[in-house]
Amino acid sequence: EEELQMIQPEKLLLVTVGKTATLHCTVTSLLPVGPVLWFRGVGPGRELIYNQKEGHFPRVTTVSDLTKRNNMDFSIRISSITPADVGTYYCVKFRKGSPENVEFKSGPGTEMALGAKPSAPVVLGPAARTTPEHTVSFTCESHGFSPRDITLKWFKNGNELSDFQTNVDPTGQSVAYSIRSTARVVLDPWDVRSQVICEVAHVTLQGDPLRGTANLSEAIRVPPTLEVTQQPMRVGNQVNVTCQVRKFYPQSLQLTWSENGNVCQRETASTLTENKDGTYNWTSWFLVNISDQRDDVVLTCQVKHDGQLAVSKRLALEVTVHQKDQSSDATP
């Protein structure tokens, strides 16, 4: 014999104050004929929550149209949830009777408890920049959630990280909880455009996790490589020397030219370009006057990057007799 079943699929329903709670109840049979009522609690002291036929329930609405003869969905919505609404809710089928209906079957019940959403995760990186191949730590914090169960994951550019430690406080019973996690990330030279993401999943978020991000550009320093070259052509009695500062980050850079140990104050032409990986290249041109008296000129390009110790590259100028004798026209 087939028999009516009352389906209340959720054993526990977590709701937040002020929101609307949906309590699901469906039946597997239209028989026996009779209404379905909602109660909170069991026994003689149970509280009637909804009765379609009689009473006034301003905060309760039905999900489906109960006037439909073939309706099997008796789910309800309770609006403006308060802490007073917590408890176990039962949908109960009554069999039509005379003089009054008789209780036929009850659903297993859904416990409604208050939940609190976690705050948006805040991700903080290291206080100082670090060079590639070193490890940096990022912290992620989220507060104010309940219940205590929560899942936290770390990602770098979409790839899940495994080197992290997480704590949820307090360990005992509480109205709300906090989570703090520290992830260790090894920096790569191309990480200027990278991101670390802290993802928090909680039952109150209904499958839509919260994310906090931090840009590795705030944590990384990519030191430059220097190259000083002498251009093969000259203009009149001047030789063009180039200092190429490659692949550095951040942009903060000071470049000075020295001629035989003496810092040159005069203006030099320069260009700054950005690479695809977010690092920068800086090219500076320095014009050196050639005369018969100046056979050995040593040029130094010195770079101070992001407040670090200066690095420099030297070039001993090669000025051939042939170059000295040429006219003032530009020659290859």
Epitope: S29, L31, R69, N70, D73, S75
Partner: antibody, heavy 119, light 107 residues
Framework: QVQLQESGPGLVKPSQTLSLTCTVS??????????WSWIRQHPGKGLEWIGY???????YYNPSLKSRVTISVDTSKNQFSLKLSSVTAADTAVYYC???????????WGQGTTVTVSS | DIQMTQSPSSLSASVGDRVTITCQAS??????LNWYQQKPGKAPKLLIY???NLATGVPSRFSGSGSGTDFTFTISSLQPEDIATYYC?????????FGGGTKVEIK
């Protein structure tokens, strides 16, 4: 008036998942309280009800298929869908989507789509 | 599951004849029963709902009756366009189940 149109691949390989979509036109899938059903008919045989989804998002699946069936609804696209996993040749059938409206009975049906399970 | 037994499985009648199909439920389903018509290569069409109510746009020659476990579907005067297979369906209990069908042909 409301019309239904099934769509999806006509050929599915054994052990794969059969995926069909039913597009509702001429009305909103979320208005009223209809049940949105899937029914199938094996070649030369009778009708077999697969399951339904309705207003509250509740689904009920025929126990004979329950472990393999998922019915879902996308209100933004005015569509509901059927997924049947681990198919075999025995799942070869014409698949219909249908609506049960205010009155009992499935009063609106799609024209049906033939699905063959074969390698 | 509720078993729906339909009889006969097929019948042949002349135009103008009265045609009767029966459907028996394995247990009491009150009047939670529908009747459908399916023409070859087409989707089923709802004819009768709640055992005896005529669906919108359905000719009055079709009718239904019964309650509990025994139900009857009648075509008072068979027409050529009524060539089809007819199915009963119960919706008192989940899962919904159909009868095996009755194929109606013209003599």
């Amino acid at each position: 008036q409301v019309q239904l149109q099934e769509s999806g691949p006509g050929l599915v390989k054994p052990s794969q998942t059969l995926s069909l979509t039913c597009t509702v036109s001429g009305g909103s899938i979320s208005s009223g309280s209809p049940y949105w059903s899937w029914i199938r008919q094996h070649p030369g045989k009778g009708l077999e009800w697969i399951g339904y989804i309705y207003a509250s998002g509740f689904t009920y699946y025929n126990p004979s298929l329950k472990s393999r069936v998922t019915i879902s609804v996308d209100t933004s696209k005015n569509q509901f869908s059927l997924k049947l996993s681990s198919v075999t040749a025995a799942d070869t059938a014409v698949y219909y989507c249908a609506r049960e409206g205010y009155h009992s009975g499935m009063d609106v049906w799609g024209q049906g789509t033939t699905v063959t399970v074969s390698s | 599951d509720i078993q729906m037994t339909q009889s006969p499985s097929s019948l042949s009648a002349s135009v103008g004849d009265r045609v009767t199909i029966t459907c028996q439920a394995s247990q009491d389903i009150s009047n939670y029963l529908n009747w459908y018509q399916q023409k070859p290569g087409k989707a089923p069409k709802l004819l009768i709902y709640d055992a005896s109510n005529l669906a919108t746009g359905v000719p009055s020659r079709f009718s239904g009756s019964g309650s509990g476990t025994d139900f009857t579907f009648t075509i008072s005067s068979l027409q050529p366009e009524d060539i089809a297979t007819y199915y009963c369906q119960q919706f008192a209990y989940l899962p919904w189940t159909f009868g095996g069908g009755t194929k109606v042909e013209i003599k």
